[in-house]
Every structure is written in structure tokens, then in C-alpha cells.
């Protein structure tokens, strides 16, 4: 019989003759994988295809962000008959193929995770040679990177009328809760979380008016841990300057 396949994702039309029912193109990826920053993650991806015993050249590709158009983070190519997929691209040298594409496995290991790796990834396989065909996962796998809090900046800045304010910025996932403590603040002061636009893992807390000299401590905490940092305010009394 004749099977005609329209691959809507690639806008290709393939017509093949088969003597028995064949596998269709499909990709199996989990919706989400979680891992901690600094650790490694595995992005599983397996596939089925209609080209039985395909032994020709193939390319395995992983993209980030969006399917079909997102930037490639990994690419390897296997020559006809070869089980070895030779890596041609590994962004920052952190992406490594675990699976064997000849055995329909494109699973990828991502090393030294950072919060910036928290995005969606899409696997793709391309056949060349006698058969020309390709397929890419539509929905991909979301890599959710978690991280204990880290205070990335703490500073004292001048504000109007010779006053001073303190800013503390921390990153983490889940986004950390920030608290200030210091002279005349009591034991601690909870700060309102304000994730910065376009920086989903960054949280900033402001202490608007530092009324006393001394040590001010910012504490960031989430379910994975806590971090703290301090600044010191010392004003030269009788002058308009300050030492921090």
C-alpha cells in the first residue's frame, strides 16, 4: 500500500511504499526535568520513525528556547553505518550526547547548570542519504533549574536630603525572600519581593532610610538554603559625606 505522510511541523510531503504497517514519526520527551544549579541534568528524548533499519547519515540536534528556530546548543553527526555521533557543536562545552541516535535515543546531559539554563529544549533528528527526512519535538522538555540564594549585590546609595538607602539583590529559584536587619530595625525587617523585569530569578529589596550608623545585613532565603551579606554605614557627623 502507499502511505502519504504530511509532516506539518516541517511542511514536507513524503510518499513511501510499504508492505506492512510502519512506525510513524514521534518523539517522546518528558514535560519537565528539574536539577540544581552547579549540578548536571539529563534531557531525555527518544523517537520512532518510519524508515526501517535506516543506516544512513544522520544528524542529532538540540535547540533552546523555541522549536525549529531557536539557537542550537548541541549538534552531532553520524556517518553511514557508524554508531558514533561526532559532536560538531556543544555550547560552552556543557552539552553531551548520552543516547545513541542509531538506537533512537537523543538524550542529552547538561553539565554545570546555571539559572540561565532554565528554559525549554527541543530535540531533532535529520536523516540524509537514500532517505531524506527529519523530525523535531514540538513541545520540548522544560529544564527547571533550582538554586540556593546568592546575594549578587549589596550597596548603600545616597538619597535626597543627605539620607542614605540600602539595596540588596539576590538570585535563586524559587526566588528568595529577602529581609534586612540592622540598627533600630528591630531584629529583622521583611522586605517586599520585587523580581526585576526580564530577570525572573533576581529579587531586590530596598531599605529606604538608614537612620543610624552601623551594620546592615541582608538575608536571602528559599527552600534550598540561605545567604547573607552586610554593609556598614558610618557618617562623618557635621559633614555631608558618608563612609560605607
Amino acid at each position: 500500500f502507499v502511505r502519504t505522510k504530511i509532516d506539518t511541523t516541517e511542511n514536507l510531503l513524503n510518499t513511501e511504499v510499504h508492505s506492512s504497517p510502519a512506525q510513524r514519526w514521534s518523539m517522546q520527551v518528558p514535560p519537565e526535568v528539574s536539577a540544581e544549579a552547579g549540578d548536571a541534568a539529563v534531557l531525555p528524548c527518544t523517537f520512532t520513525h518510519p524508515h526501517r533499519h535506516y543506516d544512513g547519515p544522520l544528524t542529532a540536534i538540540w535547540r533552546a528556547g523555541e522549536p525549529y528556530a531557536g539557537p542550537q546548543v548541541f549538534r552531532c553527526a553520524a556517518a553511514r553505518g557508524s554508531e558514533l555521533c561526532q559532536t560538531a557543536l556543544s555550547l560552552h562545552g556543557r552539552f553531551r550526547l548520552l543516547g545513541n541516535p542509531r538506537r533512537n535515543d537523543l538524550s542529552l546531559r547538561v553539565e554545570r547548570l546555571a539559572l540561565a539554563d532554565d528554559r525549554r529544549y527541543f530535540c531533532r533528528v535529520e536523516f540524509a542519504g537514500d532517505v531524506h527526512d527529519r523530525y523535531e519535538s514540538r513541545h520540548g522538555v522544560r529544564l527547571h533549574v533550582t538554586a540556593a540564594p546568592r546575594i549578587v549585590n549589596i550597596s548603600v546609595l545616597p538619597s535626597p536630603a543627605h539620607a542614605f538607602r540600602a539595596l540588596c539583590t539576590a538570585e535563586g529559584e524559587p526566588p528568595p525572600a529577602l529581609a534586612w536587619s540592622g540598627p533600630a530595625l528591630g531584629n529583622s525587617l521583611a522586605a517586599v519581593r520585587s523580581p526585576r523585569e526580564g530577570h525572573g530569578h533576581l529579587v531586590t529589596a530596598e531599605l529606604p532610610a538608614l537612620t543610624h550608623d552601623g551594620r546592615y545585613t541582608c538575608t536571602a532565603a528559599n527552600s534550598l538554603g540561605r545567604s547573607e551579606a552586610s554593609v556598614y554605614l558610618f557618617r562623618f557627623h557635621g559633614a555631608s559625606g558618608a563612609s560605607t
Partner: antibody, heavy 121, light 111 residues
Amino acid sequence: EVQVVESGGGLVQPGGSLRLSCATSGFNFNDYFMNWVRQAPGKGLEWVAQIRNKIYTYATFYAESLEGRFTISRDNSKSTVYLQMNSLRAEDTAVYYCTRSLTGGDYFDYWGQGTLVTVSS
Amino acid sequence: DIVLTQSPDSLAVSLGERATINCRASQSVTISGYSFIHWYQQKPGQPPKLLIYRASNLASGIPARFSGSGSGTDFTLTISSLQAEDVATYYCQQSRKSPWTFGQGTKVEIK
């Protein structure tokens, strides 16, 4: 046929230096990571160092206790990997094996016969 | 560092009988279903040889009487029918986290 041949072992005094070489053939050297694994006499195996390939920026990794004293390097034109060992101690006495690993897996699919390093006064 | 503990330290098995070696990791070495444990065989005076990679995959040229299983922290190497040529020391190794570490080894002998 894959071949991995170590050389450069021998007797050295404590505090001395030695450079081990590992010549390979029978495979495309550029496609693989290379490692050194050692085995003290009558003891178990201990991974020493890894050097990755060009795609992986020739990144190097070391056992923490050895970092700073040992340096792994590779010469792709000669399909050879090296281990420079400085400030040698008695506890570095071992057979040193050169091993190959795939870019996707840190397991060692081919091993050389090893070269014996003896650190003694 | 991840510590691998093999048991038993030595094992005597009759020819044709099953030999089982265990390897326990101090923390999980499995990520998303992939287990980063590998097994090697070392005969006296020879370098080690890869038997099993990623817990259960038979290396090229290794007889089917060798098999591996396990997940998380507990792994097993099984020789289904011990042959005279299987007398050796067997090591597990993890590549979940650097530094890569080995178990202390299990010596297999004929009973």
C-alpha cells in the same frame, strides 16, 4: 584495531618529576576524551585526570588531591596524551593507565597496558 | 566525593553457578532514568576491561552471561554461569559527579 600504549614510567626520587606519554592508534583521536587512571600495587583503581577534545575546549579535570602537581595535555597531531607529574611522593607509586572515553560518557572503553611509576629514595 | 562500596570483598562460586556483586553509592547516581555506574573486570597482570556501561548496557564483545542492573544507589553485576576465565577482580565506577570514583573491588574465585 584500537591501540593505547603508555611509556615514560620508571624510578624517581621523592620531589622529582616525570612525564608519561600515551600513544594511540586505530581510532580518530580527535573524537574522544582521554584519561589517566592509576593503581597502586595491590590496591584498587583511582581516576587521575581527564582531557576533553577540541569541541569541548580541551577542558581538563583532575582528582582534587592531585591538582596543581599533575598536568594532563594532548597533541592531536601525534594522537598522544601526556601526564606531567611534579613534586612526586611515595604515595604516587602506581601503575598508570591511559584510557579512552566517549564524549558522551565518562566510562573507559579502552585501556593501555599501563606504565609503572615508582617514587622512592 | 561519591563513595562506592562493593560487597562482598571476595566471592567463591562453583563453575556454572551464578555470581552476584553489589555496588552501593553514597548518593544517587541516577538522573532522569540514566544511571552513571559502570563495571570493569581486571585479571591478574592485565589492565581493566569495560564490561557494562550505564548500569545495564553490555560493552562490545562481552559475553551475554554478564549483566548489570540497579538504580539510584544500589547496583548489581551478575555473572549468570561462572566460567573459569571469569576469575578476576571486578570494579564499579561512577560518572555521576566528578571526581569519577571506583569501588574497592570484589575478587571472584572458583569454589
